[in-house]
C-alpha cells in the first residue's frame, strides 16, 4: 500500500506555482498527461492536457497553466503563472493510458494563496515578459474523457490515504471532465 | 517518521574505491526520487548525483562523471553510490537525501558518512 | 550552471534581533529556491521550499521571499538554537542543483 501524501506551497496572488512531476520514462514518456483540481466532494478536474501523444519539450498553455513534458528526463513541468485566491486547492498530475485508468503521480500539491503580493526589489514574478515568454499554444485535441468503471461517492481524501501502486505511480479510480480557459494573447 | 541512515564510509587510498550505502524508511520509498550531497570539511554543500523514483533516470555533477555510479533497490528501499578513481578532492561527509515529491530540494537528510581519500 | 551567492559570509546578531539574509542567483529561477539550516556536526535540516513556504515543523518566526533572483531568509526573532550556517539552494529545472556558500549566523 501507498500513502497518498500532499505537499503545501504557500504562495501571494500573482506569484507562480511551478513543480515538478517526476514519472518512469521507459513506461510514460510519450503518454498524455494531465494537471487536475480535486475539489471537495467532486472528482478531479482536468485543467490542462499535454498533447497525444505527448511531445518533447513542447510547451502546451491552457489559460495559466503551462504544461512541459521532458521526456529524456521523465518530468512534466507545470507552471500555474499570475496566481489568484480563488486557486488555492489540492492538485495532481496524471497520466492518461487507455484503455486503463490514469495513474497519479506523487505528490498532491496543496496551493494555498493569499492576498498581496511579497516580492522584493528587482523580482520579476510579475513581469509580463517573464510570464509571457512561453507562445502560447494549447492543446490540438480536448482532454479524454474517461468514465470510470466505478463510481465515485465521496471525495477524494484531504490527508492520507492506502492506495495500491504499480511502481511510482498511484493508480486512479476516476477521471474527469475538462475546464478550459481563454488562453493569453 | 522519513529517516534514512548511510554507512560504508571510511579510509580509501587515492585511486580506490568505496561503496556508500543509504537505507530509507518511513516513506514510500520507490515514489521519490533519492540524492547525494557531499560537504569537505568546513566547506559548503555540493549536490553529488540524483536518481529518480523507479531509478530510470539518474543525475551527476561534473566533478563525478563517470567515477560515481548511483542506483537503488526498491524491493530493500535501500540507496547506494559506487565510487571509482577516488580523489583527495572527494573527501567529504557524504549524506543520503530524500528529494521531495514535487521539485528538486531535499526534505529529509541523513546524518552523513565520512568519506577520507587520503595515501 | 546558475550561481548562488549569499551574503553576508557571516552575520553577528544578539538574541531576540532580527536577521536577515540574503541569496542571489546568476539567473532568474522564479520562486525555485530552497533554504536551510545546518549545526556543527548536523545534516542540514530543510526550513523552506518554493522561496515561501515554510517546511513542517518549522517555527513562524522564519520566512521567505523574493523571486527571480533575490531571496531573503528572514529570521523575526533569533533563539539560541537559530545560530548555525544557512543554505540556499535552487531547483529551477535540470541539474545541477547549487547551493550558495553558506552565511553563518553568530551570537553578537
Known amino acids: 500500500a501507498t500513502k497518498l501524501t500532499e505537499e503545501k506551497y504557500e504562495l501571494k496572488e500573482g506569484q507562480t506555482l511551478d513543480v515538478k512531476c517526476d514519472y518512469t520514462l521507459e513506461k510514460f514518456a510519450s503518454s498524455q498527461k494531465a494537471w487536475q483540481i480535486i475539489r471537495d466532494g467532486e472528482m478531479p478536474k482536468t485543467l490542462a492536457c499535454t498533447e497525444r501523444p505527448s511531445k518533447n519539450s513542447h510547451p502546451v498553455q491552457v489559460g495559466r497553466i503551462i504544461l512541459e513534458d521532458y521526456h529524456d528526463h521523465g518530468l512534466l513541468r507545470v507552471r500555474m503563472v499570475n496566481l489568484q485566491v480563488e486557486d488555492s486547492g489540492l492538485y495532481q498530475c496524471v497520466i492518461y493510458q487507455p484503455p486503463k485508468e490514469p495513474h497519479m503521480l506523487f505528490d498532491r500539491i496543496r496551493l494555498v494563496v493569499t492576498k498581496g503580493f511579497s516580492g522584493t526589489p528587482g523580482s520579476n514574478e510579475n513581469s509580463t515578459q517573464n510570464v509571457y515568454k512561453i507562445p502560447p499554444t494549447t492543446t490540438k485535441a480536448l482532454c479524454p474523457l474517461y468514465t470510470s468503471p466505478r463510481t465515485v461517492t465521496q471525495a477524494p481524501p484531504k490527508s492520507t490515504a492506502d492506495v495500491s501502486t504499480p511502481d511510482s505511480e498511484i493508480n486512479l479510480t476516476n477521471v474527469t471532465d475538462i475546464i478550459r480557459v481563454p488562453v493569453f494573447n | 517518521e522519513v529517516q534514512v541512515l548511510e554507512s560504508g564510509g571510511g579510509l580509501v587510498q587515492p585511486g580506490g574505491s568505496l561503496r556508500l550505502s543509504c537505507a530509507a524508511s518511513?516513506?514510500?520509498?520507490?515514489?521519490?526520487?533519492m540524492s547525494w550531497v557531499r560537504q569537505a570539511p568546513g566547506k559548503g554543500l555540493e549536490w553529488v548525483s540524483t536518481?529518480?523514483?523507479?531509478?530510470?533516470?539518474?543525475y551527476y555533477a561534473d566533478s563525478v562523471k563517470g567515477r560515481f555510479t548511483i542506483s537503488r533497490d526498491n524491493s530493500k528501499n535501500t540507496l547506494d553510490l559506487q565510487m571509482n578513481s577516488l580523489r583527495a578532492a572527494d573527501t567529504a561527509v557524504y549524506y543520503c537525501?530524500?528529494?521531495?515529491?514535487?521539485?528538486?530540494?531535499?526534505?529529509?537528510w541523513g546524518q552523513g558518512t565520512l568519506v577520507t581519500v587520503s595515501s | 550552471e546558475i550561481v548562488m551567492t549569499q551574503s553576508p559570509a557571516t552575520l553577528s546578531v544578539s538574541p531576540g534581533e532580527r536577521a536577515t539574509l540574503s541569496c542571489r542567483a546568476s539567473?532568474?529561477?522564479?520562486?525555485?529556491l530552497a533554504w536551510y539550516q545546518q549545526k556543527p556536526g548536523q545534516a542540514p535540516r530543510l526550513l523552506i521550499y518554493?522561496?515561501?513556504t515554510r517546511a513542517t515543523g518549522i517555527p513562524d518566526r522564519f520566512s521567505g521571499s523574493g523571486s527571480g533572483t533575490e531571496f531573503t531568509l528572514t529570521i523575526s526573532s533569533l533563539q539560541s538554537e537559530d545560530f548555525a550556517v544557512y543554505y540556499c539552494q535552487e531547483f529551477i529545472m535540470f541539474p545541477p542543483w547549487t547551493f550558495g556558500q553558506g552565511t553563518k549566523v553568530e551570537i553578537k
Open positions: 539567473q532568474s529561477i522564479n520562486s525555485n
Open positions: 536518481i529518480s523514483g523507479s531509478g530510470s533516470t539518474t
Open positions: 518511513g516513506f514510500t520509498f520507490n515514489a521519490y526520487a
Open positions: 518554493g522561496a515561501y
Open positions: 537525501a530524500k528529494v521531495a515529491g514535487s521539485n528538486f530540494f531535499f526534505d529529509h
